[in-house]
């Protein structure tokens, strides 16, 4: 009786169970009554990452420098190439097909998390007692100057965009 289902790492074809090709190899010919499945290794620029019956290997991803991409990890016959972005850029999507410049945090916001090749800058509003007066992809919110430690007094209150202005204490009493 011909099988209706096959074991793991096998597939059903012409009423018989044939072995799948291992990762890194493509299917050339199904098994026959005389021989096992014929598989061949993927070529230099190709890969297959699972046990498969694919008759063509997949091309490795191309990290296009014109799109700001560079190779993070070279592909093998069993893995795809992993691209990442050049310095100052990050991936536009999870598949990282192109890159965009890191965003800067505007005045009043500081960098909570510096961007990487795969993630954008994360900004946060400067809380009370902190400020940022620049547009930057690196600078965190900075604390207001402590006038007291300098034996000075606050002449102008700070905001999320400006530091306090300290001045000498009024000695006229």
């Amino acid at each position: 009786e011909p099988p209706t289902a096959c074991r793991e790492k096998q597939y059903l074809i012409n009423s018989q169970c044939c072995s799948l090709c291992q990762p890194g190899q493509k299917l050339v010919s199904d098994c026959t009554e005389f021989t096992e499945t014929e598989c061949l290794p993927c070529s230099e620029s190709e890969f297959l990452d699972t046990w498969n019956r694919e008759t063509r290997c997949h091309q490795h991803k191309y990290c296009d420098p014109n799109l700001g991409l560079r190779v993070q990890q070279k592909g093998t016959s069993e893995t795809d190439t992993i691209c990442t972005c050049e310095e100052g850029l990050h991936c536009m999507s999870e598949s990282c097909e192109s890159c965009v410049p890191h965003r800067s945090c505007l005045p009043g916001f500081g960098v909570k998390q510096i961007a990487t090749g795969v993630s954008d800058t994360i900004c946060e509003p400067c809380p009370v007692g902190f400020f940022s007066n620049v547009s930057s992809a690196f600078e965190k919110c900075r604390p207001w100057t402590s006038c007291e430690t300098k034996d000075l007094v606050v002449q102008q209150a700070g905001t999320n965009k400006t530091d306090v202005v300290c001045g000498p204490q009024d000695r006229q009493r």
């Epitope: 074809i13 026959t32 014929e38 008759t55």
Partner: antibody, heavy 116, light 111 residues
């Protein structure tokens, strides 16, 4: 049972094009095997791989013959073909077609003589 | 790529064992477990006897066996019989969907 049969002229003039066809019967050219090959054997000499074709048309050629050889496929006729340009007497051989890269099925071969 | 190197001839008496070698490089025989052996009788098409170094198609007698060490593959025919007299060719995958054959070995069964 899978069978392969080569056909084409047995005599070709020097500098002309050698053309052969392999007809597959007992199975489809686009299922069970997905790659098909050509091999030749000059009289009294050894086997030489010419090239292979994927049923969707991708081709793989021997580096030594690459500049002169073209392999094509016609799935509707269950055939694949060989063309060899600018032939010389050195191309006189028995030409075989075969299945896959393992070559577990062969045609019976056809002798092609290059002579004027 | 160059043809794989086989001895031009080998011989043995009926019942004996004979081994035919097939030497390539690390880019073909040594680099892949894709060595095949073919038997060819005069005027006939070659017949696959061994594939993937040591696997035998069903129907091929178990007197035929294959092995590989480094860049050299071997075909051993044990219990030699008169019908084993033929030419034997090895082939190997050579990367990038390329194949290469050996030059062939004429096996003679003595007596």
């Amino acid at each position: 049972q899978l069978q392969l049969q080569e056909s084409g002229p047995g005599l070709v003039k020097p500098s002309e094009i050698l053309s052969l066809t392999c007809t597959v019967s007992g199975g489809s050219i686009s299922s069970s095997s997905y790659y098909w090959g050509w091999i030749r054997q000059p009289p009294g000499k050894g086997l030489e791989w010419i090239g292979n074709i994927y049923y969707r048309g991708d081709t793989y050629y021997s580096p030594s013959l690459k500049s002169r050889v073209t392999i094509s496929v016609d799935t509707s006729k269950n055939q694949f073909s060989l063309k060899l340009n600018s032939v010389t007497a050195a191309d006189t051989a028995v030409y075989y077609c075969a299945k896959g890269f393992r070559f577990d099925y062969w045609g019976q071969g056809t002798l092609v003589t290059v002579s004027s | 790529q160059s043809a794989l190197t086989q001895p031009p001839s080998a011989s043995g008496s009926p019942g004996q064992s004979v081994t035919i070698s097939c030497t390539g490089t690390s880019s073909d025989v040594g680099g892949y477990n894709y060595v095949s052996w073919y038997q060819q009788h005069p005027g006939k098409a070659p017949k696959l006897m061994i594939y993937e170094v040591s696997k035998r198609p069903s129907g091929v007698p178990d007197r035929f066996s294959g092995s590989k060490s480094g860049n050299t593959a071997s075909l051993t025919v044990s219990g030699l019989q008169a019908e084993d007299e033929a030419d034997y060719y090895c082939s190997s995958y050579a990367g990038s969907n390329n194949l290469v054959f050996g030059g062939g070995t004429k096996l003679t069964v003595l007596g």
